[in-house]
């Protein structure tokens, strides 16, 4: 909220680099054919390009990505009996970011 | 993706926990006039609980939260007006986490 | 430190334009508005206009509406001022400021002089 | 627009003389009033912001007061480095306005 001024620091900008986010690991990721199975683990950590820039016209864009494979574990019910697979779930981790030029969007014609 | 089984390190849980994420500042100080010349910064740091808990039936949720008071610079232009500003943002940091139970939504009657 | 540097001298012929650079560094760039400032020989000062450089966002004096266009390049932290249509009163020692609610860094100046 | 004018347009002094220059604008500013220094040759110098605070690495011997519509900029002892010419600058309204200058040197 916007209140008076109180005792406060200048505030800082959250400048443009990588950051640790949460990623949903979600069944469509696993298997679109079947809904009758579990996931382990739900979700998982992941580097991810965030921040402002020091305009409007650019955004922070991931300059370097990283494709990290994990193993998941898929909880299959079969007939009311679990079934354990694994399953390998594809990451990707930003390794470096940049403030980059958004392109302008194209008039309608 | 889903790929066939490569030589996958097994997925870790991201757990419930405190992580940086970043706040954009400017929504909250866009006036509906548009009479705002510049805000800076246009985005802060902040602390928030994310990640996932061992059930479906239970979030992240912060268990303690603090209020920080932050001064942002601001430059208003009201009918040939420019106004300097420095205004107080109070952002609300999430200091510690806990999976709780998700009260079940209420049948509408 | 703070530092703006500025381009260098032009020689115009009426009608032309002149575009100024002012290269900003040893700040947050973004934080900042650009104003420019003009000094006609022997004469005191004139403010133009001024640009955001978070966001683009100008405002001009009435005087120079029409004539001026100011822009910025967060790329290179640069500020240009276009002035178009010269005439020989446009003659002048362009600055660039950096600004909030003074103009607290200034470039070293840009002699235009417009001349038939 | 918001019209500056100052006073003298120009002035000798001595060497540790107190020299004070008014600026007086056409309509109440409240205190958004700036004062610079300007060298002949290079670019104005800011020197005192909002009516009467001074920037930081500027000598003490210059101090600024007033509010409203009247001014005055007050170099307490003059000293031959302070021969400039000298502008008042309103921030209340847009476009930003400076007073006509005030030309110091030593007699």
């Known amino acids: 909220s916007l209140g008076s001024l109180t005792v406060a620091e200048p505030a800082m900008i959250a400048e443009c680099k990588t950051r640790t986010e949460v990623f949903e690991i979600s069944r469509r990721l696993i298997d679109r054919t079947n809904a009758n199975f579990l996931v382990w683990p739900p979700c998982v950590e992941v580097q991810r390009c965030s921040g402002c820039c020091n305009n409007r016209n650019v955004q922070c864009r991931p300059t370097q990505v990283q494709l990290r494979p994990v193993q998941v574990r898929k909880i299959e019910i079969v007939r009311k009996k679990p079934i354990f697979k694994k399953a390998t779930v594809t990451l990707e981790d930003h390794l470096a970011c940049k403030c980059e030029t958004v392109a302008a969007a194209r008039p309608v014609t | 993706s889903l790929g066939s089984l490569t030589v996958a390190e097994p997925a870790m849980i991201a757990e419930c926990k405190t992580r940086t994420e970043v706040f954009e500042i400017s929504r909250r100080l866009i006036d509906r006039t548009n009479a705002n010349f510049l805000v800076w910064p246009p985005c802060v740091e902040v602390q928030r609980c994310s990640g996932c808990c061992n059930n479906r039936n239970v979030q992240c949720r912060p268990t303690q939260v603090q209020l920080r008071p932050v001064q942002v610079r601001k430059i208003e232009i009201v009918r040939k007006k420019p106004i300097f500003k420095k205004a107080t943002v109070t952002l609300e940091d999430h200091l510690a986490c806990k999976c709780e139970t998700v009260a079940a939504a209420r049948p509408v009657t | 430190q703070v530092q703006l540097v500025q381009s260098g001298t032009e020689v115009k012929k009426p009608g032309a334009s002149v575009k100024v650079s002012c290269k900003a560094s040893g700040y947050t760039y973004g934080a900042y508005a650009i104003s420019w400032v003009r000094q006609a020989p022997g004469q005191g000062l004139e403010w133009m206009g001024w640009i955001s450089a978070y966001n683009g966002n100008t405002n001009y004096a009435q005087k120079f509406q029409d004539r001026v266009t100011m822009t910025t390049d967060t790329s290179t932290n640069t500020a240009y001022m276009e002035l178009r249509g010269l005439k020989s009163d446009d003659t002048a020692v362009y600055f660039c400021?950096?600004?909030?609610?003074?103009?607290?860094?200034w470039g070293q100046g840009t002699l235009v002089t417009v001349s038939s | 627009d918001i019209q500056m004018t100052q006073s003298p347009s120009s002035l000798s002094a001595s060497v540790g003389d107190r020299v004070t220059i008014t600026c007086q604008a056409s309509?109440?500013?409240?205190?958004?009033l700036n004062w610079y220094q300007q060298k002949p040759g290079k670019a104005p110098k800011l020197l005192i912001s909002d009516a009467s605070t001074l920037e930081t690495g500027v000598p003490s011997r210059f101090s600024g007061s007033g509010s409203g519509t009247d001014f005055t900029f007050t170099i307490s002892s003059l000293q031959p480095e302070d021969i400039a010419k000298y502008y008042c600058q309103q921030y209340y309204n847009l476009p930003f306005t400076f007073g006509p200058g005030t030309k110091v040197d030593i007699k």
């Open positions: 400021a950096r600004a909030w609610n003074s103009f607290d860094y």
């Open positions: 309509q109440d500013i409240r205190k958004n």
